[in-house]
Interface confidence: medium
Amino acid sequence: NFMYSKTVKRLSKLREYQQYHPSLTCVMEGKDIEDWSCCPTPWTSFQSSCYFISTGMQSWTKSQKNCSVMGADLVVINTREEQDFIIQNLKRNSSYFLGLSDPGGRRHWQWVDQTPYNENVTFWHSGEPNNLDERCAIINFRSSEEWGWNDIHCHVPQKSICKMKKIYI
């Protein structure tokens, strides 16, 4: 009976996500058969989050809207380990919007999910950010420094990275 009600709950939860994510890839968390964590197929997973590389070229605002339609946000990078995971799925000749912007052009950077901006956990390329009229952040590859962040104009179409919390069922 307990197993039956658990299954019913899982099915109703899966139905919630079906609209945006017709297919989920789930893995068993730990040793308990009851706990599964899922990411939409073909998103990738790292720790408690799912990631999607959007290859369509759009402005920052449109990229964020595109992520939000999928129940996600443009990516917020919290650690070096997280960035190291993300870059494994990126192409060196492309740039990708992050969920980081400076709307007022006063170098008050802010993350889309209101995570406090911490100067100590940023990965700007050397000399960046350097253009006051460029108020959105991308991650890109520079041969001298590998992967890092750069400020660019928010209207310039780029690829993007979406991030959402894992779905637990």
Epitope: G105, G127, N130, D133, C154, H155, V156, P157
Partner: antibody
């Protein structure tokens, strides 16, 4: 007084190259994004290239991508446009133009030079 | 690319009357509540001069007889009362989508 002065235009054969310059004065060049915009003989205006204030970001329309390169020397207050593999459709008056100093308004040019004429003959 | 269609291609207006120029975009030029549509004036032998940015903001030094309105895809430049020195070609430009594009121009003649 804000001034932008273009030079380097002229007559060039199809497939040839040309380097345009734009010397600026009257404002802090290194703080402003600059674009090249051209005007065809039919008076049609077409954006050609953009370079960020720091010189690290450059953008081009498909019509010139791979053929034109925009660059700047902030120490010399000078903007450049290197044009190669020139075609007859590149014949135009080329203007350098300063962007409005508002990040919210993209590609809005508030001051323009007098232009330099480029003619590509076949 | 966003196509901007200006109309009329040319118009003649009597001194002191109103000149109205229309600019229609092939898709919305709204970006986060800002209308990224701008107006320029160009006189023969001169470069374009910015008159109005973001649909309705008058650039500094431009006389108040110039005004802009509109949103989404339909925009208008009004000049009232028209003066002799307003004889020129007027262009609209959008900056919402890369690449930025310009309208074909409207030539204003003063009668």
């Amino acid at each position: 007084e804000v001034k932008l002065v273009e030079s380097g235009g002229g007559l060039v054969k199809s497939g040839g190259s040309l380097k345009l310059s734009c010397e600026v004065s009257g404002f802090t060049f290194s703080s402003y994004t600059i674009s090249w915009v051209r005007q065809t003989p039919e008076k049609r205006l077409e954006w050609v290239a953009y370079i960020s204030s720091g010189g690290d970001n450059a953008y081009y329309p498909d019509s010139v991508k791979g053929r034109f390169t925009i660059s700047r020397d902030n120490a010399r207050n000078t903007l450049y446009l290197q044009m190669s593999s020139l075609r007859s459709e590149d014949t135009a008056m080329y203007y350098c133009a300063r962007h409005l100093y508002y990040g919210d308004y993209f590609y809005v040019m508030d001051y323009w030079g007098q232009g330099t004429s480029v003619t590509v003959s076949s | 690319d966003i196509v901007l269609t200006q109309s009329p291609a040319s118009l003649a207006v009597s001194l002191g009357q109103r000149a109205t120029i229309s600019c229609k975009a092939s898709q919305s030029v709204d970006y986060d509540g800002d209308n990224c549509l701008h107006w320029f004036q160009q006189k023969p032998g001169q470069p374009p001069k910015l008159l109005i940015y973001a649909a309705s903001n008058l650039e500094s030094g431009i006389p108040a007889r110039f005004s802009g309105s509109g949103s989404g895809t339909d925009f208008t430049l009004n000049i009232h009362p028209v003066e002799e020195e307003d004889a020129a070609t007027y262009y609209c430009q959008q900056s919402n989508e890369d690449p930025p594009t310009f309208g074909g121009g409207t030539k204003l003649e003063i009668k």
